[in-house]
């Protein structure tokens, strides 16, 4: 049994880290492998993750890491029974992938303006709470080429756009994702999308 692609891990920097790797051949990850992880700290326990399959040879493990701080460093040991397949380490603060924003809502009754709001996925006492900025993706349900990204470079989880910038009488969808520039994070997954009908009508022109 051999590791083809070594585990790579990302952390949501609140309670969970996710590690993925590939084996040399088809593997029943949960039956054959265990990922042992331990905070490098004198009295920390050695916890263990039972991996799940991610494709025929791919494995994924979700590691519980509460109360994360910048200095936290974990040792990782991948075992097949009593055989150590791989040994490594992981510093959550250096591999941040934020949680996806939540509760995306579109308000269409704000005079010719669309108001999109969502919630920051972190509690106010978390390090990432004030570090997140966002990207909003809006697209036409019937026309995949009619898609746009709005960068929300401020921290307030809202976006206002003129309804006139979208086609009238068309159903649109929106989704939002987050990143933390100061942590050099990757982008979060996209939030679930929300749908609305753009009923905006062009003002009647006088000649």
């Amino acid at each position: 049994m051999k590791v083809l692609q070594e585990p790579t891990c990302v952390s949501d920097y609140i309670s969970l880290s996710t590690c993925e790797w590939k084996m040399g051949g088809p593997t029943n990850c949960s039956a054959e492998l265990r990922l042992v992880y331990q905070l490098v700290f004198l009295i920390s326990e050695t916890n263990m993750c039972v991996p799940e399959n991610n494709g025929a040879a791919g494995c994924v493990c979700h590691l519980f890491m509460e109360d994360m701080v910048g200095a936290d460093n974990y040792t990782l040991d991948l075992w097949a029974g009593q055989q150590l397949l791989w040994k490594g380490s992981f510093k959550p603060s250096e591999h941040v992938k934020p949680k996806a924003p939540e509760n995306l809502t579109v308000y269409t009754n704000v005079s010719e303006t669309l108001l999109l709001t969502w919630s920051n996925p972190y509690p106010p006492d978390n390090y990432l709470y004030e570090k997140l900025t966002y990207a909003v993706n809006i697209w036409n349900e019937n026309d995949p080429t009619d898609s746009r990204i709005y960068d929300v470079t401020y921290q307030e989880p809202t976006l206002r756009i003129a309804a006139s910038t979208l086609k009238s009488g068309v159903s649109y969808r929106a989704r939002v994702r987050a990143w933390a520039q100061s942590y050099n994070s990757t982008w979060s997954e996209w939030s679930p999308s929300t749908k609305w009908y753009n009923a905006y009508k062009e003002p009647f022109e006088k000649h």
Epitope: I14, S15, L16, S30, V36, I43, E45, T46, N47, M48, C49, V50, E52, H62, L63, F64, M65, E66, D67, Q82
Partner: antibody
Framework: EVQLVESGGGLVQPGGSLRLSCAAS?????????MCWVRQAPGKGLEWIGC?????????YYASWAKGRFTISRDNSKNTVYLQMNSLRAEDTAVYYC????????????????????WGQGTLVTVSS | IQMTQSPSSLSASVGDRVTITCQAS??????LAWYQQKPGKAPKLLIY???TLAYGVPSRFSGSGSGTDFTLTISSLQPEDFATYYC???????????FGTGTKVTVLG
């Protein structure tokens, strides 16, 4: 110093109730581990009662014999875990230990305790009339 | 899950090699720990994950086994090792933790 300190033990009449406390110091009680209770009757072996996950998912596990009469709870703001014992009987007389435990998890929803690494000094509960 | 520990007691001399066994009633992989307890004291963790030595535990203690059969070995018994030893098995199918009945190690003679 990292330690667990139990309190609340004492003499209680059969049928009575008692709440034991376990105060954690030197580490955050809300970090990634389980907090558990284990008891030992005089001259007998160790007996697991149950555990509560200290982090954001407060999942609990109990020994089958403890379900219903024994309840484990926590107050992370006080770094304290509790054991509420009801309908006490003479056979519940024991030293009650608080212990911190490692865990095994599968996915994000299945997480269970699997060994006790750090123990308190224990508190004696005597059930007698 | 049931944990059958044997022997229940044994007498030995300083320097002896001591072996204690623990048998689980179902496959518990390597979810087994060993503890040492002295009178009036809390148990002390010796071994976890069947064979991993806990921090600060002397190397004369070792553990082996997986599945249903496990062994704790003290390679050369020291005066401070006279105590009661317990195994602890964990079943993730039920989330339960069960201790063995204990093995009391006393001084021979």
């Amino acid at each position: 110093e990292v330690q667990l300190v139990e309190s609340g033990g004492g003499l209680v009449q059969p049928g009575g109730s008692l709440r034991l406390s376990c105060a954690a110091s030197g580490f955050s009680s809300s970090s990634a581990h389980y907090m558990c209770w284990v008891r030992q009757a005089p001259g007998k072996g160790l007996e697991w009662i149950g555990c509560i996950y200290a982090g954001s998912r407060g999942s609990t596990y109990y020994a089958s014999w403890a379900k219903g009469r024994f309840t484990i709870s926590r107050d992370n703001s006080k770094n304290t875990v509790y054991l509420q014992m009801n309908s006490l009987r003479a056979e519940d007389t024991a030293v009650y230990y608080c212990a911190r435990a490692a865990f095994v998890n599968r996915g994000v929803s299945w997480i269970w305790p699997y060994y006790f690494s750090l123990w308190g000094q224990g508190t004696l509960v005597t059930v007698s009339s | 899950i049931q944990m059958t520990q044997s022997p229940s007691s044994l007498s030995a001399s300083v320097g002896d090699r001591v072996t204690i066994t623990c048998q689980a009633s179902e496959d518990i992989e390597s979810y087994l720990a060993w503890y040492q307890q002295k009178p009036g004291k809390a148990p002390k963790l010796l071994i976890y994950r069947a064979s991993t030595l806990a921090y600060g535990v002397p190397s004369r203690f070792s553990g082996s086994g997986s599945g249903t059969d496990f062994t704790l070995t003290i390679s050369s018994l020291q005066p401070e090792d006279f105590a009661t030893y317990y195994c602890l098995g964990s079943s993730y199918s039920t989330g339960s933790n069960i201790f063995g009945t204990g093995t009391k190690v006393t001084v021979l003679g």
